[in-house]
Each structure stands twice: as structure tokens, then as C-alpha cells.
Interface confidence: low
């Protein structure tokens, strides 16, 4: 009769580092002591006629255990294969590029350490929950890669790596480990430089807007903009609408920046840069300043009129040019009554890079002179009819402007000047018309001859 030696459990599956209770038993009636052969740590727990129970501890790897016993002088054996499964100790997705250009490929790399049995371990690369690649885990550590074409929609998308240890055939289920996700940032930076709109000339201490625009940028809100006048950084306001970025700044030139300068606009995104430069000339254009030696002159005095401007500026005063650019234009006159209120005009011209810039200025002269009554406007003999309406058309002049009054000789009777009034016979007589100011008096005699009204 052939006797058997049974080993239970048969072909067990347990998690790494676990313990296993093994029972060896035989139906041989005259068996000796049952032995267990294994490289694992073992302990005899109990035994009896034809059986022995052992505890195996810290089972870390696949192993074959063998029970043996002598029965009637012959050795009989039984065996069982232990399969150990373990979850990966590390599942890590390698860092993604800090910025990834849209339309270019990038590589996802996942590294898996540990995990057994490898035949049941699969590595999955994911974008959101979308599977990009599914590959078996091979080698130790296992490294799985996938090539992905970056699109705009990947901006902000999380990528991750998942391991699946499929122990479902052994009735133990599917064990899943997932790496920490990594966020991708994608970008589009066109090859064209930004459009820079800046003035060709900029006067010292004046301000002018500078615009820098770049289209086809994604994500426009992530771009960095640097605007500068020479080495002076400008404070830019950046706006983005869709894929268009616009930076606006105000350029103000300092006196120490005079001369040929550059306006620079740099747009940086994803570690790449696009640059535009425009030439600009900073210039100083002082004046023209027109001066009078006496803003208010006395009649007969000498007045000097001068016009000056900054270096390299050609001035012309009342049509008379200065001897050379940067020099003063001057003229002298004897102040007369006719010069009162006269304006002196000065024009200034500055050449900047072949362009001529023009500016004008003027000043008005006041001449002080005594009162006068213009005989042409003030008839000395008037013949008017009684009971008619008339105006005494007399005009005085002078600086300061004189007061004009016409008083009848021998009485204090005054007739209005420049205002219509009714004439009657009592107005008949001789009048003293006097213009007076702080600079003196001027008198003119006016005779009014009033013709009595005829009743027939």
C-alpha cells in the first residue's frame, strides 16, 4: 500500500513579511517524526501520531516547503509552493518640465520600487483619469515611460502614475498605488518679436506712452514683461485679452539721458524670451524765452528785446535771426506811443535727427505816455439843431488810459462823451474837453452852435 504525506495549505499566497501555519500529515500507521525542510524561519507548534504543525514567520519571498517522513523504512515527501505578494514601496512620477512648449513631445517617467509578484504588476501613466500608457513592471526598480504631445489643453492638467497588483486570480483583489500628481504648464510663444510703439523723439522731463504687444501667446497671463528706456525700467501696466498681451508704460526722459537711446520690450514665457527694440532720441529744448529790459517803458526810453533758447537752438526775433544756434537774438528801440501794446515774436528751431522742431513765444511791451485827444475824432465846431439827438464823438488815448470830460466854460455843465443825448439851446456855448491821467492833462476846445427850432 502507498501512503501519502499531505502539506496544507497547498500553494498559499500571503503578503510579504507575513506568517504561515503549515500542517503536515500522513495516513501511514507506523510513521516516524515528520520533518519540515525550508530556508524560512520555522517553529514546531504541535505534533501527534502522523502529523506535525509548524509556524513559518517573516516570509519575504517565494519559497518551496518540503515535508518528509519515514514510513516502514521508506521516505515519503509532500510539498507546497508559497507565493509572496507585496505592494510597491515607492511609486514616483519624475518631475515634469517647468514649462512645456505646445506642439512638442515630452516624456512621462514613472519609477516603481518593490512590488511582487512582478508578473502581476502593471504600471499605468495617467493624464487626469485618462490612461496614456499601460505597461508591465519589469526589472528592479521598474521604469515606465510614455511620450506625450503637449497641447494647450494640457496646461494645468495633472499627470500621475498608478501601479496595479492584480491578485484577483488568487482571490485577493486588485491592489492600487498612485503617485503624487504633477501639474504640467504648457505654453505658446510665437517666434515673432513684440510690436513696440514708441516715440522717435522724447523731450527731457516730458512723458509719452509706450505700447508693447505680442499676439499668439499662451497663457498670456503667465508672461513677464520688461519695458525700459535705456537702463531705466519703466513701470508697465500689463493687460491680456485671450492670446494677446499688451504692456503700456509712460516713458519720462531725464536730463542725464539726453542723446541716442533705445526703448526695449522683453516678453518672457516658459523660460524663453522675445525682444523688440526701437531707437529714440532724448532731446532738451529750452525756450524760447523772450525778455524785455523794461516790460513797462516810459515814452522816449530805450528798450532792449532779447530772445534766448537752449544749446543748438536757432532763434529768430521779429524776423531777425541770431548769429548762430545757441546764441541770443536782440533788438533795441526808442519807446514811442505807437509801440504801446506791440508784440515781439520769437521763433525757435531745433534739429533732432534730421527733423526740425519749432516753438514760438512772444512778449508785449507797454509804453507809458501822456493823455491826448485825437482831433480827427473830436470836431472842434459842432452845428446841431435844437431838440435833436446827437453823440459827442471824442476819443482820448494814453497809458495809463485817461479820463475824458467836456465841461462848459463858465459853468459846471458837463456833456456826455460817446453817449447819445438830446440837444437843446441851453447846450450852446464853448466846452473844455479835458483828458487827464497820472501822466498829465490835455485840453481841446469844442464849440457847440445850437440852431433854435423854427416853429413855422
Amino acid at each position: 500500500q502507498e501512503f501519502l504525506l499531505r502539506v496544507e495549505p497547498q500553494n498559499p499566497v500571503l503578503s510579504a513579511g507575513g506568517s504561515l501555519f503549515v500542517n503536515c500529515s500522513t495516513d501511514c500507521p507506523s510513521s516516524e517524526k515528520i520533518a519540515l525542510e525550508t530556508s524560512l524561519s520555522k517553529e514546531l507548534v504541535a505534533s501527534g501520531m502522523g502529523w506535525a504543525a509548524f509556524n513559518l514567520s517573516n516570509v519575504t519571498g517565494n519559497s518551496r516547503i518540503l515535508c518528509s517522513v519515514y514510513c516502514n523504512g521508506s521516505q515519503i515527501t509532500g510539498s507546497s509552493n508559497i507565493t509572496v505578494y507585496g505592494l510597491p514601496e515607492r511609486v514616483e512620477l519624475a518631475p515634469l518640465p517647468p514649462w512645456q512648449p505646445v506642439g512638442q513631445n515630452f516624456t512621462l517617467r514613472c519609477q516603481v520600487e518593490g512590488g511582487s509578484p512582478r508578473t502581476s504588476l502593471t504600471v499605468v501613466l495617467l493624464r487626469w483619469e485618462e490612461e496614456l500608457s499601460r505597461q508591465p513592471a519589469v526589472e528592479e526598480p521598474a521604469e515606465v515611460t510614455a511620450t506625450v504631445l503637449a497641447s494647450r489643453d494640457d496646461h494645468g492638467a495633472p499627470f500621475s502614475c498608478r501601479t496595479e497588483l492584480d491578485m484577483q486570480p488568487q482571490g485577493l483583489g486588485l491592489f492600487v498605488n498612485t503617485s503624487a500628481p504633477r501639474q504640467l504648464r504648457t505654453f505658446v510663444l510665437p517666434v515673432t518679436p513684440p510690436r513696440l510703439v514708441a516715440p522717435r523723439f522724447l523731450e527731457v522731463e516730458t512723458s509719452w506712452p509706450v505700447d508693447c504687444t505680442l499676439d499668439g501667446l499662451f497663457p498670456a497671463s503667465e508672461a513677464q514683461v520688461y519695458l525700459a528706456l535705456g537702463d531705466q525700467m519703466l513701470n508697465a501696466t500689463v493687460m491680456n485679452h485671450g492670446d494677446t498681451l499688451t504692456a503700456t508704460a509712460t516713458a519720462t526722459a531725464r536730463a542725464d539721458q539726453e542723446g541716442a537711446r533705445e526703448i526695449v520690450c522683453n516678453v518672457t514665457l516658459g523660460g524663453e524670451r522675445r525682444e523688440a527694440r526701437e531707437n529714440l532720441t532724448v532731446f532738451s529744448f529750452l525756450g524760447p524765452i523772450v525778455n524785455l529790459s523794461e516790460p513797462t517803458a516810459h515814452e522816449g526810453s530805450t528798450v532792449t528785446v532779447s530772445c534766448m533758447a537752449g544749446a543748438r537752438v536757432q532763434v529768430t526775433l521779429d524776423g531777425v535771426p541770431a548769429a548762430a544756434p545757441g546764441q541770443t537774438a536782440q533788438l533795441q528801440l526808442n519807446a514811442t506811443e505807437s509801440d504801446d501794446g506791440r508784440s515781439f515774436f520769437c521763433s525757435a528751431t531745433l534739429e533732432v535727427d534730421g527733423e526740425f522742431l519749432h516753438r514760438n513765444s512772444s512778449v508785449q511791451l507797454r509804453v507809458l505816455y501822456g493823455p491826448k485827444i485825437d482831433r480827427a475824432t473830436c470836431p472842434q465846431h459842432l452845428k446841431w439843431k435844437d431838440k435833436t439827438r446827437h453823440v459827442l464823438q471824442c476819443q482820448a488815448r494814453g497809458n495809463p488810459y485817461p479820463e475824458l470830460r467836456c465841461l462848459k466854460e463858465g459853468s459846471s455843465r458837463e456833456v456826455p462823451v460817446g453817449i447819445p443825448f438830446f440837444v437843446n439851446v441851453t447846450h450852446n456855448g464853448t466846452y473844455q474837453c479835458q483828458a487827464s491821467s497820472s501822466r498829465g492833462k490835455y485840453t481841446l476846445v469844442v464849440v457847440m452852435d445850437i440852431e433854435a427850432f423854427s416853429s413855422h
Epitope: D153, P219, S221, E222, N240, D243
Partner: antibody, heavy 119, light 112 residues
Framework: QVQLVQSGAEVKKPGASVKVSCKAS????????ILWVRQAPGQGLEWMGK????????TYNLKFKGRVTITADTSTSTAYMELSSLRSEDTAVYYC????????????WGQGTLVTVSS | DAVMTQTPLSLPVSLGDQASISCRSS???????????LHWYLQKPGQSPQLLIY???NRFSGVPDRFSGSGSGTDFTLKLSRVEAEDLGVYFC?????????FGGGTKLEIK
Amino acid sequence: QVQLVQSGAEVKKPGASVKVSCKASGYTFTDCIILWVRQAPGQGLEWMGKINPYFGTTTYNLKFKGRVTITADTSTSTAYMELSSLRSEDTAVYYCARKEAYPDAMDYWGQGTLVTVSS
Amino acid sequence: DAVMTQTPLSLPVSLGDQASISCRSSQSLVHSNGDTYLHWYLQKPGQSPQLLIYKVSNRFSGVPDRFSGSGSGTDFTLKLSRVEAEDLGVYFCSQSTHVPYTFGGGTKLEIK
């Protein structure tokens, strides 16, 4: 379950501004994109812009010429749409919607907010 | 902008009938990544729009299989195999390949 709850109806005068809110729940706010769409009375749908709350990045419909500003507060899972320089033709129902990157479609919508612009 | 043209404007049907709506784009909706971002929405009276079909032919979760989408490039179609009362409303096609995203003018599905 995913829900987008919008603020109540508004009546505004021409030239004023309006700010509509959209509170998200039932999912991780920074995992999806929020979009704004409007519908004038008896008319079709018009896309205004979108925001990625994770980065705060926005894309706008240029038709609104800088009048629209979309923001997101991740601490309260709330998105906002502000429309300035209102005119009578801005009278519409304003919807917020969300989309995942995959699929790239608006899978959940808010209930809508009626904005009336009238002098 | 990609202009989306829907036909017909109005579609009178009897319950149980088949219905077909066409949507044409002024430019190709094939994205540089190879996907076509053409979607269909239904807006029932007094409600917000709801997603039916995404990326040309994929039914959104919970959408009955009587709805199907097809097409490529610039021409797309939404088909209903058997119209039910709950299907009535305005159908919109929409693209998200190009910014700005745009919608068709809508097709009103109504009972004859």
C-alpha cells in the same frame, strides 16, 4: 453630486457694473475649468470667457473689449464674472459652467442669473 | 471666429419619429492634438443647457442611446432615433477647438 449655484437676479443702470458669483461643490474646484456663457432673451448662447482656478489663468472673448473680468477664489470654491460699462444689449441670463480637460465640454451648468440693464 | 451654422431652425416631429440636426463650421474643428472638440447641448424650456454629446460622438453619462453624434472636419450631425416628449427643447452645437468658443444658433425640436 456636482453643483454650480449662482447669485440672484440683478437690475442695473446703463454704465454701471455687475458681478455674478458661481459657487461650486461636489468636486475639487481646482481640478476643472469654469466658463461663463450668456443668453439674451430669445437668443442663442454666447461664450464670454474661462478661468483655470488652479493657476488663475483666464481667456476672454475679445468681443467684450476688456469689459469682462473673471476671477476665482479657491478658498471658497467660488468663481466670479464682472461686466462693466453695461448697456441695454447686455440684458441676458448669465450662466457659469464647468469643464474637465477631458472631455473638453461643459458637463455641468449653473441655474443662470438674469441681469437686466435699464434706465 | 469659427461660425457655427445649424439647420433646420425649427424641426416639427411626431413622437416616435426619427430626427436629424445638422451643424456646419466655417473652419475645421480638428485640434492640433488630433481631437475634434464639437459638442451638442439641449436646453429644455426654462432650464439651463445640458450636455448630450462631447467630442463629436461620445454620449455623456446618463444620456439615452437614442442620441448619437457623427461627422468630421466641418460637418456634423446629431440624430435621435425615436423622439420622446422629454427630448423637446432647443439643441445647440458648440465648438471648443478655437478661441473664442462658439455656439450654433439652435434648432427647436417641437411636436407637429
